[in-house]
């Protein structure tokens, strides 16, 4: 199972639920569904309040039980380390895969943290991060922002991923904007 890590804004916008949490306990495999279940302790929720309704405390995250079908394997054994988890809700349960955005909170830049907590949501409705995988590539719409990080280096390590968000400049037009300048 291979997938290109998304721009964090894309991960935020395409996810039903975005939380900060610690992985605690030993993973378990459900012997009916064959899904692996990680116990988590949620510390913050950034997206999903409406989707969750009253069940605002997520205690488990679910993933396929095998790597080849995109199961997520949590490698850290540090139970006090916080992770940003962006996943999908299925039957009220948080699901993630290898392709989901799961990253140690401490590994995120200050700009990315600002994005997840406040800014990415502003670009979700109107703007699209458009991956540029090979040259030449051109904008297909004024609401697209060309994401070129993959051309230069690992997509999640690039400047646009770590410091920029695709946000509305005016109706029908989105541009890359610095998250740094927005950090209070």
């Amino acid at each position: 199972c291979t997938c290109v890590p998304p721009h964090p804004q894309t991960a935020f916008c395409n996810s039903d639920l975005v939380i900060r949490a610690k992985f605690v306990g030993t993973p378990e495999v459900n012997q009916t569904t064959l899904y692996q279940r990680y116990e988590i302790k949620m510390t913050k929720m950034y997206k999903g309040f409406q989707a969750l309704g009253d069940a605002a405390d997520i205690r488990f995250v679910y993933t396929p039980a095998m790597e080849s079908v995109c199961g997520y394997f949590h490698r850290s054994h540090n139970r006090s380390e916080e992770f940003l988890i962006a996943g999908k809700l299925q039957d009220g349960l948080l699901h993630i895969t290898t392709c989901s955005f799961v990253a140690p909170w401490n590994s995120l830049s200050l700009a990315q943290r600002r994005g997840f907590t406040k800014t990415y949501t502003v670009g979700c409705e109107e703007c699209t991060v458009f991956p540029c995988l090979s040259i030449p590539c051109k904008l297909q719409s004024g609401t697209h922002c060309l994401w070129t990080d993959q051309l230069l280096q690992g997509s999640e390590k690039g400047f646009q991923s770590r410091h920029l968000a695709c946000l509305p400049r005016e109706p029908g037009l989105c541009t890359w904007q610095s998250l740094r300048s927005q950090i209070a």
């Epitope: 030993t26 495999v29 012997q31 569904t33 064959l34 095998m66 790597e67």
Partner: antibody, heavy 113, light 111 residues
Framework: QVQLVESGGGLVQPGGSLRLSCAAS????????MSWVRQAPGKGLEWVSA????????YYADSVKGRFTISRDNSKNTLYLQMNSLRAEDTAVYYC??????WGQGTLVTVSS | DIALTQPASVSGSPGQSITISCTGT?????????VSWYQQHPGKAPKLMIY???NRPSGVSNRFSGSKSGNTASLTISGLQAEDEADYYC??????????FGGGTKLTVLG
């Protein structure tokens, strides 16, 4: 009591196909993931494939991926293994297992020309 | 392609205790509490003796016990009896290969 009975084994030529069945009784079939495990003559056990209770998730060993297909019919309490492009190294006793607690007695598949 | 390492053979006299080891990695034995042990007599299907590292199914003698330390699981049989002579296989959940087995250990009861 829990019972698993395999059938469908036999002699088949290399490149041929075979479909194994496993009739289950004595438990709520749809509540359990099921697996196929095989054992070549004089050798150890090798996991082949698994399927979730609903049939929505299927997993395969690398050695059979793309050639074997696991499926189930919960209305008939039956598990299946469709085996295509069979090779000599697929020769084994094939066991059906209720996610590794109860096992059937096995059915022998021989791939030979 | 044996994933878990077991001794090829062990032996003991009636009444003695023996232990069979099963060594894996942190992605199988060490990472999960899903280790099972099976007993297989010649020409028979495997029979579950221990599941989830140390649990015994009903009907299995309490002479059989399981444990785990790090990446190694162990099956101990106390008060060895003639009918214990069989092949024993360990099995673990593994994230990459889903289910993996040991190569099997032939237990011989002497005398």
């Amino acid at each position: 009591q829990v019972q698993l009975v395999e059938s469908g084994g036999g002699l088949v030529q290399p490149g041929g196909s075979l479909r194994l069945s496993c009739a289950a009784s004595g438990f709520t079939f749809s509540s359990y993931a099921m697996s196929w495990v095989r054992q070549a003559p004089g050798k150890g056990l090798e996991w082949v494939s698994a399927i979730s209770g609903s049939g929505g998730s299927t997993y395969y060993a690398d050695s059979v991926k793309g050639r074997f297909t696991i499926s189930r019919d919960n209305s008939k309490n039956t598990l299946y293994l469709q085996m295509n492009s069979l090779r000599a190294e697929d020769t084994a006793v094939y066991y059906c297992a209720r996610f590794f607690d109860y096992w059937g007695q096995g059915t022998l598949v021989t791939v030979s020309s | 392609d044996i994933a878990l390492t077991q001794p090829a053979s062990v032996s003991g006299s009636p009444g003695q205790s023996i232990t069979i080891s099963c060594t894996g990695t942190s992605s199988d034995v060490g990472g999960y509490n899903y280790v099972s042990w099976y007993q297989q007599h010649p020409g028979k299907a495997p029979k579950l003796m221990i599941y989830d590292v140390s649990n015994r199914p009903s009907g299995v003698s309490n002479r059989f016990s399981g444990s785990k330390s790090g990446n190694t699981a162990s099956l101990t049989i106390s008060g060895l009896q003639a009918e214990d002579e069989a092949d024993y296989y360990c099995q673990s959940y593994d994230f990459v290969r889903f289910m993996v087995f040991g190569g099997g250990t032939k237990l011989t009861v002497l005398g």
